[in-house]
Interface confidence: low
């Protein structure tokens, strides 16, 4: 039989991944009312929209942005000035340096005369008017507009000791997930910042080798499990008064400040109140604190009365963050997700008491994030539809209608291409644009608020689309399996001939951290897209114990325990997939990055003798080497009397003999200030000290994500080369 | 209640000096920005010079072109008081010296104004 | 700098009469404008902040309006106490502080 001439599809190249030929775009809005918003052109232009006149016009020119090379910018909410963000020099995850040039679109010229500082760690508006508040060299600045010389709020900034508005490493990376650490109030009359007093945490320190003659060694403060935390402080300051009477302190509540303690959110409720979150160390009781603005004591008070606490007494508190309030219209109720008594996370509504919460939504599922509560509806996501854990859908509840009506917004909109949703609404929802993620290619669209009408489709992929009609695209399937009780949701990606006859190399990709998900049902052409496409590859991604979405008791499972049953879990698939029958049982590999690099590790080390090679990238190799808020989270503290013994017993490095049997591949960049290059180091030197032959590659410089362009081809051509000299298949 | 009261006036020569008050109560003076403002006979209003802290006991200066490197702008908190040092003054500088008190900490528009002082230059 | 322009030098009007007050800028001053009354012999005396934010006691007939380069300044019924020079002023781009050259209105 010959191949019918109809089929000229090819099949991925690795080099059309390393290119990101087959990259998607998303359509975010930028709202700045009820029916505007801006959004950047493919050209760099800057331009805004109105939803109901149909207007659109430039605002901003590239020309503009070109000439002080700016790659971001954001609009003054008297529409007056335009910041322009330029010299973008990553730092963290989310933190980043840049310098900043304001724009005045009525002169249509720069701000000239107290021009800002360079380079700026935080920037940002107010959300009224055109007041700036930045953080440069740890200290936080105000100018009431951009012309006037900036008014010094904080003096006590100093590199790796204290940080005013914005968080050090721990804070940013296992607390906020933000660059920043203030908060204006929604009149712009006040701002909340913390102060992070990093002077007593152990140093990380790492060199970084550069060009120079002598590498330099950089220093960061980074509290490892067990050792001493920041000492965090909130502040607010009158930005009309600064200094009047200066940065006023909010307090924290007594049975939070008995013990070591975090901050872990700040919400304005309204321009007088303000919403903290804390938590205790041991992270399974969180306190949410309402304060109130005592002018006549010139202070923030924050009653007894006023304090709502969470507690979990099978696990942590909250999903990976605990979650954060949504306050209705009278300041004073509020929407928030947590466990119910079946240990599903569900909306509730708290008026008085968390004890007297009305639960809102519930059912053997998730509710994900509150998007938006207006003065007649709750929006919100869920994994609700059809019982797909890894599916996000968008529902309105009509709270203004009594009794309350459920509508799923998205659920039957693109039924087969869309089911994993985000949302963006303007400030009171008359408008949003959903933005869908999958499984077919994604789509940004527009909708009315009031009859969720689709208005206008924002971005289709179009020209994704028809350069992916000559690609030979894998298969994608979501399943379930089951084994003794527990339901395992897994993808697998099928190679585009799939014959359920033959056999084919397994590679397993793992990640399995606490309170994260693999399979979820989204588009994405990546590495292993290409695996299956080109080298006949199957891949599948298992959601075992300690994943999210599917209740606390699935999720709580890790707890205290970590690296047990995210590996037992992963073998257990491994089976179930070979008793499919498509699975050569001599070609199956794993392999994982970060937490996926630590359950890569252990189970290549189990002893099962099932895989027969693996890779690693930056693995977490011992819990006692990763952060305090992360690691302490998920197995409390490296003490005697607390956890130590599984501390001790859960390290890659434990198990050394044991990768006697299988190819290890170990990969880390020199630079990783997250999962700190001192772990592969340790398993390297365990693996020496047992005489074990393995694989390894440094990348020099490179931090947890090797994402420099140079080294992210170097790495994946490198694990390419390994798995197929592993599976055998023939370059 | 809030009272700015000049005094320091009277007729010099050209290129005298001159050292303008300014007493300040019923406010907390170190929290607002300070202006002198002046007014020529028979003519409209024209900014001189003001002082505003910038936190930490920093403090700005800012003057109209037309009396920088002659004028000097101070204050003492200590006392509440506002000053205004005019060397080398001109013709030109003849007019009533009014003290004003911004609005706000940052806003440098005026909600309270002395009753001024008379300087007049003339040879 | 930013240079302000009033219109009219001088109104006339008769006392219950509607006055409007112009006051243009060569340049934006977005919303940072000020009005002033000065009655002759006497101190100068805010009457309207941010544009059109009345200052304390100052009587409901006084109202501000516009943004960005022209502004307006509107005493709805005039009262014989109105007759007096009125001054705008920008603080939004500064130094210098500017302010107009000021609007007499006269009794008609």
């Known amino acids: 039989l010959r191949p019918s001439r109809g089929n000229t599809k090819r099949a991925l190249t690795l080099k059309d991944i390393l290119n990101g030929t087959f990259s998607y775009k998303t359509y975010f809005p930028n709202w700045i009312s009820e029916q505007e918003y801006l959004h950047q052109s493919e050209d760099d232009n800057i331009v805004f929209y109105n939803i109901e006149t149909r207007e659109s016009y430039i605002i901003l020119s590239n020309s503009t942005m070109k000439s002080v090379n700016a790659t971001d910018y954001g609009l003054s909410p008297d529409r007056q000035f335009v910041y322009l963000e330029s010299d973008y020099s990553k730092l963290w995850r989310y933190s980043y340096t840049a310098t900043y040039y304001i724009y005045d679109l009525q002169n249509g010229e720069f701000v000239r005369g107290y021009e800002l500082p360079r380079p700026i760690q935080y920037l940002c508006w107010s959300p009224v008017g055109s007041k700036l508040a930045y953080v440069y060299q740890n200290n936080i600045y105000l100018k009431q507009r951009p012309g006037d010389p900036p008014f010094q709020i904080t003096y006590t900034g100093r590199e790796n000791r204290i940080f005013n508005g914005i968080p050090d490493w721990v804070y940013e990376e296992e607390m906020l997930a933000t660059k920043y650490a203030l908060w204006w109030s929604p009149d712009g009359k006040f701002l909340a910042y913390v102060e992070f007093n990093d002077s007593d945490i152990p140093i990380i320190a790492y060199s970084y080798y550069g060009d120079g003659q002598y590498p330099r060694t950089i220093n960061i403060p980074y509290p490892k499990a067990g050792a001493k935390n920041p000492v965090v402080r909130v502040f607010i300051v009158d930005t009309t008064y600064p200094h009047h009477v200066g940065p006023m302190e909010v307090p924290v509540p007594e049975m939070i400040a008995s013990s070591d303690y975090y901050f872990s959110w700040l919400t304005w409720v309204s321009s007088e109140r303000v919403c903290l979150q804390w938590l205790k160390r041991v992270q399974n009781v969180s306190v949410l604190s309402i304060c109130d603005f005592r002018e006549d004591w010139h202070a923030w008070e924050c009653p007894k009365n006023q304090e709502h606490v969470e507690e979990s007494r099978t696990g942590w508190a909250g999903g990976f963050f605990v979650s954060t309030p949504a306050f209705s219209q009278d300041a004073t109720s509020y929407y928030k997700i947590f466990s119910d008594k079946d240990g599903y996370k569900h909306i509730h509504y708290i008026k008085d008491t968390v004890e007297n919460a009305i639960q809102i939504t519930s059912g053997k599922w998730e509710a994900i994030y509150i998007f938006r509560v207006t003065q007649d509806s709750l929006f919100y996501s869920s994994n609700e539809f059809e019982g797909y854990p890894g599916r996000r859908n968008i529902y309105r509840i009509s709270i203004g209608n009594s009794p309350p009506s459920k509508k799923c917004v998205t659920c039957h909109l693109r039924k087969e291409r869309c089911q994993y949703y985000t949302a963006s609404f303007s400030y009171k929802a008359k408008y949003y644009a959903l933005v869908c993620y999958g499984p077919g290619l994604p789509i940004s669209t527009l909708h009315d608020g009031r009859t969720d009408q689709e208005i206008q489709v924002l971005e289709e992929n179009k020209e994704l689309e028809n350069s992916l009609r000559n690609i030979q695209l894998p298969k994608v399937e979501i399943k379930k399996l089951k084994d003794g009780g527990l339901t395992f949701w897994y993808k697998m990606i099928l190679p585009p001939q799939f014959d359920r006859s033959k056999k084919y190399p397994l590679l397993i990709q793992v990640y399995g951290g606490p309170c994260s998900q693999s399979v979820k049902s989204v588009f994405a052409v990546n590495w292993i897209t290409y695996l299956a496409s080109k080298e006949g590859i199957v891949i599948a991604l298992v959601d075992g114990r300690g994943t999210a979405f599917q209740g606390d008791k699935f999720l709580h499972a890790v707890y205290r325990k970590l690296g047990v049953y995210e590996v037992e879990d992963q073998l257990t698939a491994v089976r179930k997939f070979i008793e499919m029958g498509f699975i050569d049982e001599e070609r199956i590999a794993i392999w994982g990055w970060s937490y996926g690099g630590y359950v890569s590790s252990l189970a290549l080390a189990s002893g099962t003798g099932l895989f027969k090679c693996g890779i690693a990238v930056a693995p977490v190799s011992s819990w006692e080497y990763y952060a305090s808020i992360y690691s302490e989270r998920f197995m409390g503290l490296p003490t005697k009397d607390d956890n130590l013994e599984h501390y001790k017993n859960s390290t890659v490095m434990a198990r050394a003999e044991y990768f006697r049997n299988v190819d290890y591949l170990l990969i880390h960049g020199t630079a990783d200030d997250n999962v700190h290059f001192q772990n592969s180091a340790q398993i390297a030197k365990a693996l020496v000290n047992a005489q074990v032959d393995f694989q390894a590659m440094w990348y020099s410089d490179q931090n947890h994500g090797i994402s420099s362009g140079r080294s992210q081809n170097h790495l994946y051509t490198h694990m390419t080369h390994f798995l197929k000299q592993c599976f055998s298949l023939s370059d | 209640d809030v009272q700015l009261v000049e005094s320091g006036g009277g007729v010099v020569r050209p290129g005298e000096s001159l050292r303008l008050s300014c007493a300040a109560s019923?406010?907390?003076?170190?929290?607002?920005?300070m202006t002198w403002v002046r007014q020529a006979p028979g003519e409209g209003l024209e900014w001189v010079s003001t002082?505003?802290?910038?936190?930490?006991?920093?403090?700005?200066?800012y003057y109209a072109d037309s009396v920088k490197g002659r004028f000097t702008i101070s204050r003492d908190s200590s006392n509440n008081t506002l000053y205004l040092q005019m060397n080398s003054l001109r013709a030109e500088d003849t007019a009533v010296y009014y003290c004003?008190?911004?609005?706000?900490?940052?806003?440098?528009?005026?909600?309270?104004w002395g009753l001024g002082t008379l300087v007049t230059v003339s040879s | 700098e930013i240079v302000l322009t009033q219109n009219p030098g001088t109104l006339n009007l008769s006392p219950g009469e509607r006055a409007t007050l112009t006051c243009r800028a060569s340049q934006s001053a977005g919303r940072n404008l000020a009005w002033y009354q000065q009655k002759p012999g006497q101190t100068p005396r805010l009457l309207i902040y941010?544009?059109?934010t009345r200052a304390t006691g100052i009587p409901d007939r006084f109202s501000g309006s516009g943004s960005g380069t022209e502004f307006n300044l509107t005493i709805s019924s005039l009262q014989n106490e109105d007759f007096a020079v009125y001054y705008c002023q920008q603080y939004n781009n500064w130094p210098p502080l500017t302010f107009g050259g000021g609007t007499k209105v006269e009794i008609k």
């Open positions: 002082i505003r802290s910038s936190g930490s006991g920093r403090t700005d200066t």
């Open positions: 941010d544009v059109n």
């Open positions: 019923g406010f907390i003076f170190r929290n607002y920005a």
């Open positions: 004003a008190k911004s609005g706000t900490f940052w806003d440098t528009f005026f909600d309270y």
